[in-house]
């Protein structure tokens, strides 16, 4: 369980997302098919509202293999859909602090 008041902002949010999503990369807003990119993004949800690891997972660019329904092909996103590649921001020490807080 996580504390309802837990938030992640700034570089800490970027670093934590980087670890959670790994080489899948991530979006700062979920794909438009699920939620409006403009109306609700991860900054609003995780920084100003509250955040947990499950919510962070929903912003990863591609579903984790273990989570995919084998009967359904993975969502194909447009080539130009913004995505953050692994290694651009991440530093392990910051992720460690952040995920430990989210897991409490």
């Amino acid at each position: 369980a996580y504390r309802p008041s837990e938030t992640l902002c700034g570089g800490e949010l970027v670093d934590t997302l980087q670890f959670v999503c790994g080489d899948r990369g991530f979006y700062f807003s979920r794909p438009a098919s699920r939620v409006s990119r403009r109306s609700r993004g991860i900054v609003e949800e995780c920084c100003f509202r509250s955040c947990d690891l499950a919510l962070l997972e929903t912003y990863c660019a591609t579903p984790a293999k273990s989570e995919r329904d084998v009967s359904t092909p993975p969502t194909v996103l447009p080539d130009n859909f913004p995505r953050y590649p692994v290694g651009k921001f991440f530093q392990y020490d910051t992720w460690k602090q952040s995920t430990q807080r989210l897991r409490r």
Partner: antibody, heavy 126, light 107 residues
């Protein structure tokens, strides 16, 4: 021209109220998180409050929680700071600052302040 | 909250000197650090962001380095326009916090 211009400062007695305004121009105000940062005379910089780009979601430093309210009117490109129950220690120059920066795809990736107003002086004294 | 500590508080230097200012964070902030310059009666001006990225229009004599908890701002050859107060700021997590400032004055 890209700029921020604060107004509304002045002399107020302890316990009094003031409302600061910050008029933005030269950029798409509604797409940026905005903040207030203050500086007491002869002292360093202190972050006071931030507000999400669309408004509604806010952050405050502990010393002003319950007394200050940050808000914005995106239709007027204006940021506000309502300051109530003012104390002597609130005396400072108040700057508005533009924060959260976007990459070429329009996604937020950074939170530094690249644009500051000139500041407005708030003096709390009897 | 993350505490930011700058050293020295005051630095006396001459035009042409190489100047280094240190900023330490009370916990790791990765590279989420900015440096600002402020002159008396003026608003702060962004110099460096993400610890080492030079803001557009800022002279190349300014540079930043470091990650984790220790950061430095270096002015390779001090110019008359550089006498000012310099602040570091972390934006790793709220509340955003600043160092107490380093005043660079004429020796």
């Amino acid at each position: 021209e890209v700029q921020l211009l604060e107004s509304g400062g002045g002399l107020v007695q302890p316990g009094g109220s003031l409302r600061l305004s910050c008029a933005a121009s030269g950029f798409t105000f509604s797409e940026y998180e905005m903040s207030w940062v203050r500086q007491a005379p002869g002292k360093g910089l202190e972050w006071v409050s931030s507000i999400y780009s669309s408004g509604g979601w806010t952050k405050y430093t502990d010393s002003v929680k319950g007394r200050f309210t940050i808000s914005r009117d995106n239709s007027k490109n204006t940021l506000y700071l309502q300051m109530n129950s003012l104390r002597a220690e609130d005396t400072a120059v108040y700057y508005c600052a533009k924060g959260v920066h976007y990459d070429s795809s329009g996604l937020p990736i950074d939170w530094y302040f690249d644009l500051w107003g000139r500041g407005t002086l708030v003096t709390v004294s009897s | 909250d993350i505490q930011m500590t700058q050293s020295p508080s005051t630095l006396s230097a001459s035009v042409g000197d190489r100047v280094t200012i240190t900023c330490r964070a009370s916990q790791s902030i990765s590279s989420w650090l900015a440096w600002y310059q402020q002159k008396p009666g003026k608003a702060p001006k962004l110099l460096i962001y993400k610890a080492s990225s030079l803001e557009s229009g800022v002279p190349s004599r300014f540079s930043g380095s470091g990650s984790g908890t220790e950061f430095t701002l270096t002015i390779s050859s001090l110019q008359p326009d550089d006498f000012a107060t310099y602040y570091c700021q972390q934006y790793n997590s709220y509340p955003w916090t600043f160092g107490q400032g380093t005043k660079v004055e004429i020796k």
